[in-house]
């Protein structure tokens, strides 16, 4: 499946649009809002009742090359006594982002957009039971 | 830019860094993953720090629909189902990359844009600053 064309009738394709070969698109990877920073509450990964660790994955043929993934530390959640309570479950919260993948075919290079699922952090949930046999 | 290993047999003219502008195949790899968090799981309702999901739509962006989480309570839900204000529900934020049509309205010309989204909420012990 492809990126949808602009579907709204009030959109007219401007004359200023750059010419693009069929089946591809022009992508400027100079990021808008590059310097925007996350303003999350301090150390929430350690203070959470469903704490998590971070792992950095690095791939030189991906842009951006660095993607940070979270992993829940526990199966249960941390109770008021600081102990793991397995009547509740720590679960990962995930979000999709886009990356640009560089592919080498012989000496030629092509670029592909890719959706990547990033685990952002964890939350504590009531477990659900699906099938009792 | 990002340095990458070059095939030793290839001409030296190849740039080791990602160029500023690239031509990209219109097909997106892993395109068919579920983008609606309400359908993919019900964690937002089952969490001790539950959240509501708000639809943010922008036809000049890909993906055009992004779901934003807003924590329902200041506190967290305790074992009795009540809000406990000794704990705090806080949003988990993430920077993601999206495509922005540039120039505007152009069907096949985009620029990467970094946006900040709240993905969900988690229950944390509050930081209490003591006043001397």
């Amino acid at each position: 499946r492809k990126i949808p064309k602009v579907g709204h009738t009030f959109f007219q394709k401007p004359e200023s649009c750059p010419p693009v070969p069929g089946g591809s698109m022009k992508l400027d990877i100079g990021i808008i809002n590059e310097n925007q920073r996350v303003s999350m509450s301090r150390n929430i990964e350690s203070r959470s009742t469903s704490p998590w660790n971070y792992t950095v994955t690095w791939d030189p043929n991906r842009y951006p090359s660095e993607v940070v993934q979270a992993q829940c530390r526990n199966l249960g959640c941390i109770n008021a006594q600081g102990k793991e309570d397995i009547s509740m479950n720590s679960v990962p919260i995930q979000q999709e982002t886009l990356v640009v993948r560089r592919k080498h075919q012989g000496c030629s290079v092509s670029f592909q957009l890719e959706k990547v699922l990033v685990t952002v952090g964890c939350t504590c949930v009531t477990p659900v039971i699906h099938h009792v046999q | 830019g990002i340095t990458i290993p070059r095939n030793p047999g290839c001409p030296n003219s190849e740039d080791k860094n990602f160029p500023r502008t690239v031509m990209v195949n219109l097909n997106i790899h892993n395109r068919n993953t579920n983008t609606n968090p309400k359908r993919s799981s019900d964690y937002y309702n089952r969490s001790t720090s539950p959240w509501n999901l708000h639809r943010n739509e922008d036809p000049e962006r890909y993906p055009s629909v992004i779901w934003e989480a807003k924590c329902r309570h200041l506190g967290c839900i305790n074992a009795d189902g009540n809000v406990d204000y000794h704990m705090n529900s806080v949003p988990i934020q993430q920077e993601i990359l999206v495509l922005r049509r540039e120039p505007p309205h152009c069907p096949n010309s985009f620029r990467l844009e970094k946006i900040l989204v709240s993905v969900g909420c988690t229950c944390v012990t509050p930081i209490v600053h003591h006043v001397a």
Epitope: C72, N74, L75, N89, S90, V91, P92, V125, P127, V128, I129, H130, H131, Q133 | S41, Y43, R46
Partner: nanobody
């Protein structure tokens, strides 16, 4: 569809030990996590032990900590619950369960009765 079958339950004296086994047929334990829970007549269901497959992380209910041990044998497609220093209050039906994704326990066995006499 995965079928879970428990075995190893029985009658034991207080202070004694039992080892429960849980086998998977029609599939494998290639899930996110596995665990044991128990239910005594007129009491709430209680998870007693859980194990995450990716890293072997284990956790226990306070009531059994230090006495019960959850383990697995991937080659035999079997999970175990070693129970020692058993108490009369451990009397219950014990069920094994698997979660194919976090927070969602998909499959349960039919249960095995454990009775601890004083």
């Amino acid at each position: 569809e995965v079928q879970l079958v428990e075995s190893g339950g029985g009658l034991v004296q207080a202070g004694g030990s039992l080892r429960l086994s849980c086998g998977a047929s029609g599939g494998t334990f290639s899930s996110y996590a596995t665990g044991w829970f128990r239910q005594a007549p007129g009491k709430e269901r209680e998870f007693v032990a859980v194990l995450r497959w990716s890293d072997g992380h284990t956790a226990y209910a306070d009531s059994v900590k230090g006495r019960f041990t959850i383990s697995r044998d991937g080659a035999k497609n079997t999970m175990y619950l070693q129970m020692s220093s058993l108490k009369p209050e451990d009397t219950a039906i014990y069920y094994c369960t698997t979660a194919t994704r976090p927070g969602e326990w998909d499959y349960w066995g039919q249960g095995t009765q454990v009775t601890v006499s004083s």
